[in-house]
Amino acid sequence: RKIPKVGHTFFQKPESCPPVPGGSMKLDIGIINENQRVSMSRNIESRSTSPWNYTVTWDPNRYPSEVVQAQCRNLGCINAQGKEDISMNSVPIQQETLVVRRKHQGCSVSFQLEKVLVTVGCTCVTPVIHHVQ
Amino acid sequence: RKIPKVGHTFFQKPESCPPVPGGSMKLDIGIINENQRVSMSRNIESRSTSPWNYTVTWDPNRYPSEVVQAQCRNLGCINAQGKEDISMNSVPIQQETLVVRRKHQGCSVSFQLEKVLVTVGCTCVTPVIHHVQ
């Protein structure tokens, strides 16, 4: 799902207040609900009729450093006989998410939000056909 | 997918540098890749064999203010005849994501990262049967 544009109003102080110096804001250390955890069914990526694999990308200057991307294994979906059936299609489910980018020059460290597109898994759909003349 | 614990090392300055004053960091205004957009197939939530509905939650002190949560419509999956087949199960696909929480007291505005669990969509899986003695 989409993250709307900031319009930068979210990060601005109220109009009656002095502006933020140097185009930066104060980010408190620590993460709210840091211990919250995904509680998905086990191995759904293999048990799904639209199975997927995971690829991990790693970047030490990003938080979280590890971002996991899913790739659908098949064009079609897996039928009751365990065969790929192309009358249906496996499609990726995507989500826009935020990460934090770390930028440093010597002892001067700053952070910036970054929007990342994550493919979270796949689902099986009826395909839409377009006929091209 | 999981976001690992910060361990707060990511947000710390190098050991040789003076510590961050007041437990906060500098967050630059603006979002990298802000114009990046989800390019999912249209209406996959209705075309899926494990269809889902969306609920929007709104919080003006969160960025993004709008967070969309999916809920699977059925226990089973929709078969070729358009009927629910309970020999298969619709299951949610979840993703941990970051949002930014805005906290203000008068003209003093600070921000903090918050971890949010988002259900992005649903997929159809072969159920695992546990027999309880």
Epitope: K83, E84, V132 | -
Partner: antibody, heavy 129, light 108 residues
Framework: QVQLVQSGAEVAKPGASVRLSCKAS????????MHWVRQAPGQGLEWMGV????????SSAQKFRDRVTLSRDTSTATVHLEVSRLTLEDTGIYFC??????????????????????WGQGTAVTVSS | DIQMTQSPSSLSASVGDRVTITCRSS??????LAWYQQKPGKAPERLIY???NLQSGVPSRFSGSGSGTEFSLTISGLQPEDFATYYC??????????FGGGTKVEIK
């Protein structure tokens, strides 16, 4: 020259299996799905199934689903149709035909100018006890 | 599944006649229809695609029309080589293909 060349006639007994082949030439094999159509003696045309060349995914008509296997060999640009548990009603001509459809992520595009335009010459299958 | 009803199932005509064959689909298939000619012992050959487009190399006496659920193939000025069986094919319902029952055009 764009063509589909099918394997020769087959004679089989009831209960046996046959494996037919269809070799593509003159066009990019992996860009076209391949359908199989059969025609019983003096009858009309009946769709059996289709195979997608890249991953080898298939779809078959309900009536054939449990005894038809479609496969492909990209190295030789050939598709195969195997029909098992043959009955006398399986006697007929079996055709392969190309389809210019391309599907990805739930959206398919078919270029109609070269959809179902090229057919194989047909393979005669006779089931007789 | 989409049903294709083709009529007539057979007809007798003379050289030079104007012949029209119709195909009716059980639901809207837009213009996702082709017409084929088949001669005994041969594979079908496409005459018309996308309901009304003439296949390259096919004589202009063949024409197709219609969209939605009603389609027709017209041969204006039947020639001796046109005596054959004609089929319509719908390809709107991916991946399933459905053929009409066929129309045999015979010499009167």
């Amino acid at each position: 020259q764009v063509q589909l060349v099918q394997s020769g006639a087959e004679v089989a007994k009831p209960g046996a299996s046959v494996r037919l082949s269809c070799k593509a030439s003159g066009f990019s094999f992996i860009k076209y799905y391949m359908h199989w159509v059969r025609q019983a003696p003096g009858q009309g045309l009946e769709w059996m199934g289709v195979i997608e060349p890249t991953g080898g995914g298939t779809s078959s008509a309900q009536k054939f689903r449990d005894r038809v296997t479609l496969s492909r060999d990209t190295s030789t640009a050939t598709v195969h149709l195997e029909v098992s548990r043959l009955t006398l009603e399986d006697t007929g001509i079996y055709f392969c035909v190309r389809d210019s459809i391309y599907c990805k992520h739930g959206t398919c595009h078919r270029t109609v100018i070269d959809a179902f335009d090229i057919w194989g010459q047909g393979t005669a299958v006779t089931v007789s006890s | 599944d989409i049903q294709m009803t083709q009529s007539p199932s057979s007809l007798s005509a003379s050289v030079g006649d104007r012949v029209t064959i119709t195909c009716r689909s059980s639901q809207d298939i837009k213009n996702d229809l082709a017409w084929y000619q088949q001669k005994p012992g041969k594979a079908p050959e496409r005459l018309i695609y996308a309901a009304s487009n003439l296949q390259s190399g096919v004589p202009s006496r063949f024409s197709g029309s219609g969209s939605g659920t009603e389609f027709s193939l017209t041969i204006s000025g039947l020639q001796p080589e046109d005596f054959a069986t004609y089929y319509c094919l719908q390809h709107n319902s991916y991946p399933l293909l459905t053929f009409g029952g066929g129309t045999k055009v015979e010499i009167k």
